[in-house]
């Protein structure tokens, strides 16, 4: 039962961490216009990996589209590789997620196949939430080096006459949205890790067999198992396949009385 | 098609207040105070987002004038205390555009201080 | 507060004259973040609310004539009536719509020659 809930629960909340890194890629606030020690102005600028918005204070707002590839930085573009990256991996590991749930019942899919779907969308998911939180950290580090550099020379004089008020720009809603999206990611995928080791089928303890034949001492090993060392071994015996039930979290089998010829 | 019609001017005495008036009909969403002192130019006076109620005041204006609205009637307010006779004026509520221009102002009210 | 100066005060102009007025702000009134300056051009006639003529300093409000035209940006604006018609004669005002508070400039009264 523990299997499930946490395979279940790691898949519930990388489908969210997905959800907030797809919805932070979109947001148009990545990057909000700075109002601290500013002068009070009618027009509110803010950023996004795809277009800039001003929203003025009669309420209108207007966006406009980047487009251009060759003329962004060069730290933009990896930021949204490195976004477009963490929903492709964490889309495929959903997808491979929902199959390789023990909820779900494919056909006879083996649980050695379903763990290693597991084990499979849980490392997309780690790197996923990887890949948001290393596009979101690197955008806020830009953020705030520009923000530094913009203070230095906020103000920037004509003859000490005239004053242009630089816009400074502080994180937006955006980062702390991929922030949490991807640490909900990682945390999803570390989840479906853990619920694959408790998939995977244990070996179980098999006393093999043992048949003399005459003038030999060679013990037999049924079909179905490794080969064992000998009579009476304790060496645990992997089981390849069970056709009988089990149940649901059940981590090991026991043999029972229709194992041997 | 926006409608501005400003009502609540008249004669007051220095110290007393007044409370003006905007009906206001048509979309907006945000509205301005300005106001005109005979033979003289354009003052603004104070913005209001008619949605959040969040206003902002001139300096002169700030503590002795109050903008707000009522959602439910649809009108703008000019609240005035402490009038002054400097403060006779026409004073107009504008509606902020595109450009934060005013692109629909009312007719006007005077407003005229004096013992 | 940003200081708006209009010049000149008055004009005089004839029927198809082309005018020119200029406004000047203690501030730069252009929005890095849409490269657009934020002054607006208002026109007043005697006992009459203010009209608005030309926002973000070039744009035309619809029904304003196509005699009418802004340009400028930074700090730096101008008014141009390509060719006065009598109905034109009046006030005419600049205003700073960047920065709270919003500030007019103090008017250029156009005259009949």
């Known amino acids: 039962m523990a299997v499930t809930a946490c395979q279940g629960l790691g898949f519930v909340v990388s489908l969210i961490g997905i959800a907030g890194i797809i919805a932070a890629t979109c947001m148009d606030q990545w990057s909000t216009q700075d109002l601290y020690n500013n002068p009070v102005t009618a027009v509110f600028n803010y950023q996004g990996l795809w277009r800039s918005c001003v929203r003025e204070s009669s309420g209108f707002t207007e966006c406009r589209g980047y487009f251009t590839l060759l003329g962004l930085p060069a730290m933009l573009q990896a930021v949204r590789a490195l976004m477009i990256v963490g929903i492709v991996l964490g889309a495929i590991g959903l997808l491979v997620s929902i199959f390789a749930l023990k909820c779900i019942r494919i056909g006879s899919m083996e649980d050695s196949a379903k763990a290693n779907m597991t084990l499979t969308s849980g490392i997309m998911f780690i790197v996923s939430g990887l890949c948001a939180i290393a596009g979101v950290s690197v955008f806020a580090n830009m953020l705030v080096t520009n923000f530094w550099m913009s203070t230095a020379n906020m103000y920037t004089g004509m003859g000490g006459m005239v004053q242009t008020v630089q816009t400074r720009y502080t994180f937006g809603a955006a980062l702390f949205v991929g922030w949490v999206a991807g640490g909900l990611t990682l945390i999803g995928g570390v989840m479906m890790c853990i619920a694959c080791r408790g998939l995977a089928p244990e070996e179980t303890n098999y006393k093999a067999v043992s048949y003399h034949a005459s003038g030999h001492s060679v013990a037999y090993k049924p079909g179905g198992f490794k080969a064992s060392t000998g009579f009476g071994s304790n060496t645990k015996n992997k089981k390849i396949y069970d056709g009988g039930a089990r149940t649901e979290d059940e981590v090991q089998s026991y043999p029972s009385k229709h194992d041997y010829v | 098609e926006v409608q501005l019609v400003e009502s609540g001017g008249g004669l007051v005495q220095p110290g007393g207040s007044l409370r003006l008036s905007c009906a206001v009909s048509?979309?907006?969403?945000?509205m301005n105070w300005v106001r005109q002192a005979p033979g003289k130019g354009l003052e603004w006076v104070a913005w209001?987002?008619?949605?959040?109620?969040?206003?902002t005041y001139a300096d002169d204006f700030k503590g002795r004038f109050t903008i707000s609205r009522d959602d439910s009637k649809n009108t703008l307010y000019l609240q005035m205390n402490s009038l002054r006779a400097e403060d006779t004026a026409v004073y107009y509520c504008?509606?902020?555009?595109?450009?934060?221009?005013?692109?629909?102002w009312g007719q006007g009210t005077l407003v005229t201080v004096s013992s | 507060d940003i200081q708006m100066t209009q010049s000149p005060s008055s004009l005089s102009a004839s029927v198809g004259d082309r005018v020119t007025i200029t406004c000047k702000s203690s501030?730069?009134?252009?929005?890095?973040?849409?490269?657009?300056?934020?002054l607006t051009w208002y026109q007043q006639k005697p006992g009459k609310a203010p009209k608005l003529l030309i926002y973000?300093?070039?744009t035309l409000e619809s029904g304003v004539p196509s005699r009418f035209s802004g340009s400028g940006s930074g700090t730096d604006y101008t008014l141009t009536i390509s060719s006065l018609q009598p109905e034109d004669f009046a006030t005419y005002y600049c205003?700073?719509?960047?920065?709270?508070?919003?500030?007019f400039g103090q008017g250029t009264k156009v005259e009949i020659k």
């Open positions: 504008a509606r902020s555009s595109r450009g934060n221009g005013f692109d629909y």
């Open positions: 048509g979309y907006t969403f945000s």
């Open positions: 209001i987002n008619m949605y959040t109620g969040e206003p």
């Open positions: 501030q730069s009134l252009l929005n890095s973040g849409n490269q657009k300056s934020y």
């Open positions: 973000w300093a070039s």
């Open positions: 205003q700073n719509a960047y920065f709270f508070p919003f500030t």
